[in-house]
Interface confidence: low
């Protein structure tokens, strides 16, 4: 019995831009070839338990097989590399989750309001849905001093943890980042006293 996975899928953490092509490879270990009396031509690729058509599969050499997907659209696919051994007994080699989505759009329409004596709330339009875990961070600074970052919980707004100083201009912008990219909004420059919400 083998004490490790029989091989690995690369990339191990696939994140693909929706609508693009993607290729993964499965590399079998030498010990696996000998243990199961197989080579890469015995590999069966599966997505969500369904066999991938042979025309999408290429045997690169005795240890390595590749699979190519065109126009990836599903948000999440369980991709597995399997081998047919000992008279068609299927053994799972390795499995990864392939995620697809979009890089973040440049956040737009950034606006902030100040709750008198309390805090400041900034809101923005994140653009299209990314379908991926996307972190939005509100950044702010005054002259050369940086204020603490504000990590957005919902992706469209953030309540800053500090009380902004009046009568000095601060610069505020949003950074959006996921596995496919990172982008910043245009910054806005204002005196917080001008953004006080009327009570």
């Amino acid at each position: 019995q083998l004490l490790e996975p029989c091989g690995y899928i690369y990339p191990e953490f696939p994140v693909v831009q929706r609508g693009s092509n993607f290729t993964a490879i499965c590399v079998l270990k030498e010990a696996c070839l000998q243990h199961y009396y197989v080579n890469a031509s015995y590999i069966v690729w599966k997505t969500n338990h369904a066999a991938v058509p042979r025309e999408q599969v290429t045997v690169i050499n005795r240890t390595t097989s590749s699979v190519t997907f065109t126009d990836v659209v599903l948000p999440s696919v369980q991709l597995t590399c399997n081998i047919l051994s000992f008279g068609q007994i299927e053994q799972n080699v390795y499995g990864v989750t392939m995620l697809s989505g979009f890089p973040p759009d440049k956040p737009t329409n950034l606006t902030c309001i100040v709750n008198e004596g309390k805090n400041m709330l900034c809101q923005w339009d994140p653009g299209r849905e990314t379908y991926l875990e996307t972190n939005y961070t509100l950044k702010s600074e005054w002259a050369t001093e940086k204020f603490p970052d504000c990590q957005s919980k919902h992706g469209t707004s953030c309540m800053v943890s500090y009380m902004p100083t009046y009568y000095v201009n601060i610069e505020v912008w949003v950074e959006a980042e996921n596995a496919l990219g990172k982008v910043s909004s245009e910054s806005i420059n204002f005196d917080p006293v001008d953004k006080v919400k009327p009570t």
């Epitope: 191990e12 953490f13 999440s76 369980q78 499995g95 989750t97 875990e133 596995a179």
Partner: nanobody
């Protein structure tokens, strides 16, 4: 801030059972496949098991198949590894990790010895 905190490791006799837990925070847990990996003394990281985001698909290394069961609770953002019929060769530090996120926890020590 992504955080993964394993617990449940212990000293256990061969043939015994343990249940490891991994509490996740700082990311949308249900979006991601999760996995357990382990590192035995003086060895490299070894993949143990993976589970899809919804929990419907599970995968195991040959060495643990039939003895270990991976599961998840997406309501409480927790990953589990039920380990039965433990063997001395299961002795290792066990880590949970999130697929597609370059993070893993600090690990929990499992020692199988008589």
């Amino acid at each position: 801030q992504v955080q993964l905190q394993e617990s449940g490791g212990a000293l256990v006799q061969p043939g015994g059972s343990l249940r490891l837990s991994c509490a996740a925070s700082g990311f949308t847990f249900s979006y991601y496949a999760m996995k357990w990996v382990r590192q035995a003394p003086g060895k490299g990281l070894e993949w143990v098991s993976s589970i899809s985001g919804g929990g419907g698909a599970t995968y195991y290394a040959d060495s643990v198949k039939g003895r270990f069961t991976i599961s998840r609770d997406n309501t409480n953002d927790t990953l589990y590894l039920q380990m039965n019929s433990l063997k001395t060769e299961d002795t290792a530090v066990y880590y949970c990790a999130a697929q597609n996120l370059d993070y893993r926890g600090q690990g929990t020590q499992v020692t199988v010895s008589s």
